[in-house]
Interface confidence: medium
């Protein structure tokens, strides 16, 4: 007779990532009996909210639950009902909610509080939704990648699962960009770090690791070119703002209100004898770099070493994944590749910066405007903040990898949270090596 | 020399239309915002309407919002204010002002042009 | 809007004298003040920018000061080509907005 397959002994767990820019669900399958076993976890789904982020409703929260219908729709259908009771759902809300948390605890709790009301009313094991620190953001990102890669396996293998893994067992750093923060994390060498805030201490499946991480808080792409455009609006000679890091003929009215809303920008806030602005790119790389770079006070550090505004940072250490919007900005520019150096990526930044903005759009008539304009300055951005930044070189770039996926799951905290959450990383080495997956008798 | 030479006013019968025009010469014309501000008889001033140097950017005061259209053309160097459904009450001395932001705000103003709305 | 309160409405003073006219605003306008001299028949001159800065060309017995929302055109020694309207106007905020005028006449 013909073998004849059991029904699968499956879990899945959800997270919801409520960054600043919007909201994406993702959903996570494993088999039941290989919960402690490192890289048994995948990735089965992404639905990415239709909407801009949460902190975007604070004053329309009624309208939360309507925004999260579609995906939460969508779990329904991915995740068979039998085990819909037994699903684990978090939330975790990012730097947008920071800051709405930052200009009022009381709105932010009333956005998080309709999160909660609306996520209850699904059949699955709502766990609660809640603001994730900037510490946990950069360390789940590195669990995550580090999980992914296999870097917490003590057995060598003999094959590479992703093309740039090596097969030893040095953990990969994280890089992670987001709309309104960026944090960095990475085992430093033999390196004390000097500041307790940036000390993380874990020990997996019985090995211990000393991390540092930092999270910048405004220094996210979209926060970083708000805080661009105050600090250059201090300075224009009217309300027309002749801007190095949009292409040439590019233009586009700001209002002044929309700048000085986040707390980002309170630092250049002054009173403007004009209540709107306009845009006007001359699309200049070298320029565009040079008033990106005065957004990094390197001058002050009560540290052997510093990032920049202060904060320690150790020496670099090892391999990067750099990942979330380093890598989405990256791969539209087609600059991921390991094989691009840093010289050839800002060459090919001074081209892309250069090209006139009706040209671009011809060139990428698919592409939102609105993303499209953008993508100038977020490259830039990410030479800046990479090289001046956190003190990459020339020489270091090629241990920075731009990371999508890893084995078919998105590179981000989200994975590292539900993993923690579930108790699936193991302090010790489990004693005994599971059988094979084989679910035929 | 910075010079602004306004033109157009006249006597026009409440509910007509005018259209007022601004020469300037002596500066560079397109980067330079500019304001319409005019002066009833025995009054003092009330600043009308700004348009930016690009024409992106317009701003009118509440009591001509809807009827008045401020607008240039920076080839020939002219500032314009179209007034529609003109009222008695915008009888008045009317001058354009060149602006641009911290040092140049409305530093050089014309001589004005008079408008008086009768029937 | 933002209002702004000039006082006094007119004033006479003999050449030589010194006069002093405020302006104070409603709502903070952090320094973005001009003050306007108009004589009849004669195009609006700005006198000063920014609050205190003196226009070019402008004679040193004008100066303009600030003390909280008060704002000050202070002429040290009045001359008879200084008999005029002056007014304040406020740039930190659409709509731009005068003070209601000072007519400085001869005693």
């Known amino acids: 007779t013909q073998n004849k397959a059991l029904p699968e002994n499956v879990k899945y767990g959800i997270v919801l990532d409520a960054g600043s820019s919007h909201t994406s669900l993702y959903i996570y399958k494993w088999p039941a009996e290989k919960e402690n076993d490192t890289g048994v976890v995948h990735q089965v789904e992404e639905c990415r909210v239709k909407g801009p982020g949460i902190s975007k409703f604070v004053q329309k929260v009624n309208e939360i639950g309507i925004y999260l219908t579609d995906c939460m729709e969508r779990a329904r259908e991915v995740i068979p009902r039998s085990q819909h009771q037994e699903t684990p759902v978090y939330l975790g809300a990012t730097a947008g909610m920071r800051l709405l948390r930052m200009e009022s605890e009381e709105l932010a709790d009333r956005v998080l509080d309709v999160v909660e009301r609306s996520l209850s009313n699904y059949p699955f094991d709502f766990q609660g939704a809640r603001i994730i620190t900037g510490q946990e953001e950069g360390a789940y990102g590195w669990i995550t990648i580090n999980y992914l890669l296999g870097k917490f396996s003590q057995k060598t293998r003999w094959f590479s699962i992703v093309p740039y893994e090596t097969n030893n067992q040095e953990t990969f750093g994280a890089l992670d960009l987001g709309g309104a923060s960026t944090q960095v994390t990475f085992v430093p060498q033999n390196q004390t770090i000097e500041s307790p805030d940036n000390a993380l201490q874990f020990r997996l499946y019985g090995k211990d690791y000393n991390v540092y991480t930092h999270s910048f808080l405004c220094y996210g792409k979209d926060q970083a070119l708000w805080q661009k455009l105050a600090k250059d609006i201090q300075v224009a000679s009217n309300e027309i703002l002749r801007d190095p890091c949009f292409h040439p003929g590019y233009k586009k009215v700001v209002n002044v209100s929309d700048l000085y809303k986040t707390p980002c920008t309170k630092r250049f806030e002054m009173t403007l004898p004009f209540q709107q602005f306009e845009i006007q790119g001359i699309g200049n790389y070298q320029q565009c770099h040079q008033s990106i770079l005065e957004l990094f006070n390197t001058s002050y550090c009560p540290y052997s070493q510093c990032a920049f505004n202060g904060i320690f940072l150790p020496p670099l250490q090892g391999d990067f994944g750099a990942f979330s919007a380093f890598y989405f900005v990256m791969k539209f520019l087609n600059l991921t590749s390991e094989k691009v150096s840093q010289e050839k990526v800002t060459e090919m930044m001074k081209k892309f910066c250069a090209q006139p903005w009706e040209e671009i759009k011809t060139s990428y008539a698919g592409v939102k405007e609105k993303y499209l304009s953008e993508y100038c300055f977020s490259g830039t951005y990410i030479l800046s903040l990479l090289l001046q930044g956190y003190h990459f070189t020339a020489d270091s770039w090629e241990h920075i990898h731009f990371i999508g996926k890893i084995q078919g799951s998105d590179a981000g905290w989200t994975l590292g949270y539900m993993l923690n959450l579930t108790n699936m990383i193991p302090a010790e080495q489990p004693l005994s090596t599971p059988l094979s997956h084989s679910t035929y008798v | 020399q910075v010079q602004l030479v306004e033109s157009g006013g006249g006597v026009v019968q409440p509910g007509r239309s005018l259209r007022l025009s601004c020469a300037a010469s002596?500066?560079?014309?397109?980067?330079?915002?500019m304001h319409w501000v005019r002066q009833a008889p025995g009054k003092g001033l009330e600043w009308v309407a700004y348009?930016?140097?690009?024409?992106?950017?317009?701003y009118y005061a509440d009591t001509v919002k809807g009827r008045f259209t401020i607008s240039r053309d920076n080839s020939k160097n002219t500032l314009y204010l179209q007034m529609n459904s003109l009222r008695a009450e915008d009888t008045a001395v009317y001058y354009c002002?060149?602006?641009?932001?911290?040092?140049?705000?409305?530093?050089?103003w014309g001589q004005g042009t008079t408008v008086t709305v009768s029937s | 809007d933002i209002q702004m309160t000039q006082s006094p409405s007119s004033l006479s003073a003999s050449v030589g004298d010194r006069v002093t006219i405020t302006c104070r605003a409603s709502?903070?306008?952090?320094?973005?003040l001009n003050w306007l001299q108009q004589k009849p028949g004669k195009a609006i001159k700005r006198l000063i920018y920014?609050?205190?800065t003196l226009e070019s060309g402008v004679p040193s017995r004008f100066s303009g000061s600030r003390s909280g929302s008060d704002y000050t055109l202070t002429i040290s020694s009045l001359q008879p080509e200084d008999f005029a309207t002056y007014y304040c106007?406020?740039?930190?905020?659409?709509?731009?907005?005068f003070g209601q005028g000072t007519k400085v006449e001869i005693k």
């Open positions: 002002a060149r602006d641009l932001y911290y040092d140049h705000v409305l530093d050089y």
């Open positions: 002596g500066f560079t014309f397109s980067d330079y915002g």
């Open positions: 920014a609050a205190s």
């Open positions: 348009i930016s140097s690009g024409s992106s950017i317009m």
């Open positions: 709502q903070e306008v952090s320094g973005y």
């Open positions: 106007l406020q740039y930190a905020s659409y709509p731009r907005t």
